[in-house]
Each structure stands twice: as structure tokens, then as C-alpha cells.
Interface confidence: medium
């Protein structure tokens, strides 16, 4: 079943390569388990950036080696992606799945265009 997912259209990464955005889903039911996946679309290729499962009311945790971190509050997930470089500029899509209890719901956002600008190297001082 389909579910609406909202996310900002554009986000600019910080000079340290960190970008944060909110992914909000319109939950049609009372889910106890939610899975959030961040997908990156660039040059018509879609790749999975990170994924996490969380129980409602508990923290959102990604794998230890993930470039993503996040927190959840109600039907909102606050996502942070770190370690970004200019080549990582692209459309980052939030996919939300209500895993349990049935019925299963799937929602895919329109994507957040994240722009990453590599910082200019500091000039050498004589």
C-alpha cells in the first residue's frame, strides 16, 4: 500500500561535508517497526546509501560503518549524511516502509537535491 513521504527539495551540505534533512511520512496505521532507506539517484542510477530499522519510541540506529545517522520523533525522521564531497552531489530519496504490523506500507519521497561544494584549500602562508 502507498504512503505519502515528504522531504525538502534542496539542501546544501556544510563545508565539512555534512547534510541534514527531515523525512516525514503520513502513517496510515500504528506501526511498531519502521524501516528507513536513503537512496541516491545520479545519472539515472539509483544506489542505496544507508538503511535502518527502528521501533517506534526507540532510537534510530544505522550500521557502525554507515555514513548516515538519524533520530526519530513520531512520524518524522531527522537524517544526517556525513563525509560528503562534491562528487556526491545528487538526489537523495527517502524511502519509508511500515514493516509491522500488517498491512505493509511503502512510501517514497520525491527526493532532496543535496549540493556539496568541496572547500577551497587554504593558501600556503609564507
Amino acid at each position: 500500500k502507498a504512503m505519502h513521504v515528504a522531504q525538502p527539495a534542496v539542501v546544501l551540505a556544510s563545508s565539512r561535508g555534512i547534510a541534514s534533512f527531515v523525512c516525514e511520512y503520513a502513517s496510515p496505521g500504528k506501526a511498531t517497526e519502521v524501516r528507513v532507506t536513503v537512496l541516491r539517484q545520479a545519472d539515472s542510477q539509483v544506489t542505496e546509501v544507508c538503511a535502518a530499522t527502528y521501533m517506534m519510541g526507540n532510537e534510530l540506529t544505522f550500521l557502525d560503518d554507515s555514513i548516515c545517522t538519524g533520530t526519530s520523533s513520531g512520524n518524522q525522521v531527522n537524517l544526517t549524511i556525513q563525509g560528503l564531497r562534491a562528487m556526491d552531489t545528487g538526489l537523495y530519496i527517502c524511502k519509508v516502509e511500515l514493516m509491522y504490523p500488517p498491512p505493509y506500507y511503502l512510501g517514497i519521497g520525491n527526493g532532496t537535491q543535496i549540493y556539496v561544494i568541496d572547500p577551497e584549500p587554504c593558501p600556503d602562508s609564507d
Epitope: 530499522t53 527502528y54 532510537e59 540506529t61 544505522f62 514493516m99
Partner: antibody, heavy 120, light 107 residues
């Protein structure tokens, strides 16, 4: 080292209920990073997932068994339990308890299993 | 429910052989697939999770690959202790399901 130990196996009469417990040692059942689950294996056959429980009490059941299954957790005893009612010979199996690390999408620790035989 | 079909169901090989076991899902499961090894009278042991990540303590001769609907478990050089039954399991959606198993025997 985490260990899971099932107890309560044996012979159960058809139409009765089986009750199994799994005691967790070497780690806390109250961690938010894990599910605790039950899986069974009929003699000479494959594996079947029965259900999971989260420390908060949220349960997740296989629809094929849902009407007969209850999984509960007792955090004070660091254990979780399985009750399966209205059993038949088809429920004869080795029952395993296991831990599922939420973010790894797999069962990484298993008990040694306990055999339940349904027979009159 | 998602069905997992393993092939072959039975495999006979020599020590030192390279063997591959395939697991096909009836619908896409991304990379939410695990592989287990089970020896007679013992509980299953986790080998691979999220399709290709080696569980800590598992020898590097084991490897996994695949995404979507087709997955493989490869043992690069069979050792005597590798003769066992292997199961794949999907954890993409409830109910979790297992493949029927592949029995690997010594030739």
C-alpha cells in the same frame, strides 16, 4: 559470550499446549538493538520462523501460526517464552531461540535447540 | 510470503573444490538475505548477512553476493568441516522465510 538456553521441551499431547522458555546469559535482553525470536525445525526438514519479540513487548508472528502463538518477555529474568496451543503432530520439531540484531538483518546467536514431540 | 528456492538441493564435492550455492527469491528483497550453516544435531550458524557481509569469526573462504532476487554463497576451497547443510533466509519482510536447504556432502 552471549548464550541462549531453551527449556521446556519434551512430549506434549495432541490438542494441548507447548510452553518453552529461553534464558539469555552474557547480555541483556533489554537492549534496544535486538529482537529475540523462535525458529523451529521438524525432524529431517527445513527451518521455519515462528516469531520475534522486542524487549518492550512488541511481538511479530508468522501468519501461518499467529492464531496459536504467544511470545512473551520477562526482562527481570532475562528470558522470553513461547506458547503454542492446539498442537498436532505437525508441530513436532526442534525449537530454537535466537537473537536478531536489528541492523544486521540476521540471527547471529542461537540456542542449542529443544525437541518437542507431539504424541498421545 | 516470499519464497526462497535454493539450488542445488544436494551437492557432492571434493575437499579443495570451489562450490557455489544459489538462492532465488520470488520477489525483490534488496540485500536483506542471510546464509547459515547447520551440522547434524546442531543449531544453525550465521555465515553471511546483508547478502555479502562475513560474520565475525567465519573463515574468509566463505563469501556471499547478490541483490534483488538472486544470491550466491561461495566456498572457495572446501575444507572437511564445511560439509553440512546450508540455508538462506530473507529478512526483507514478514514473515521471514528460509530456503529449503542445500546439503553439501563429501565425495
Amino acid at each position: 559470550q552471549l548464550q541462549l538456553q531453551e527449556s521446556g521441551g519434551g512430549v506434549v499431547r495432541p490438542g494441548g499446549s507447548l510452553r518453552l522458555s529461553c534464558t539469555v546469559s552474557g547480555g541483556s535482553i533489554s537492549s534496544s538493538s535486538y529482537y529475540w525470536g523462535w525458529i523451529r525445525q521438524p525432524p529431517g526438514k527445513g527451518l521455519e520462523w515462528i516469531g520475534n519479540i522486542y524487549y518492550s513487548g512488541n511481538t511479530y508472528y508468522n501468519p501461518s501460526l499467529k492464531s496459536r502463538v504467544t511470545i512473551s518477555v520477562d526482562t527481570s529474568k532475562n528470558q522470553f517464552s513461547l506458547k503454542l496451543s492446539s498442537v498436532t503432530a505437525a508441530d513436532t520439531a526442534v525449537y530454537y531461540c535466537a537473537r536478531r540484531r536489528i541492523q544486521l538483518w540476521s540471527f547471529d546467536y542461537w540456542g542449542q535447540g529443544t525437541l518437542v514431540t507431539v504424541s498421545s | 510470503d516470499i519464497q526462497l528456492t535454493q539450488s542445488p538441493s544436494f551437492l557432492s564435492a571434493f575437499v579443495g573444490d570451489r562450490v557455489t550455492i544459489t538462492c532465488r527469491a520470488s520477489q525483490g528483497i534488496s540485500r536483506y538475505l542471510a546464509w547459515y550453516q547447520q551440522k547434524p544435531g546442531k543449531a544453525p550458524k550465521l555465515l553471511i548477512y546483508t547478502a555479502s557481509t562475513l560474520q565475525s569469526g567465519v573463515p574468509s573462504r566463505f563469501s556471499g553476493s547478490g541483490s534483488g532476487t538472486e544470491f550466491t554463497l561461495t566456498i572457495s576451497s572446501l575444507q572437511p568441516e564445511d560439509f553440512a547443510t546450508y540455508y538462506c533466509q530473507q529478512l526483507n519482510s514478514y514473515p521471514y522465510t528460509f530456503g529449503q536447504g542445500t546439503k553439501l556432502e563429501i565425495k
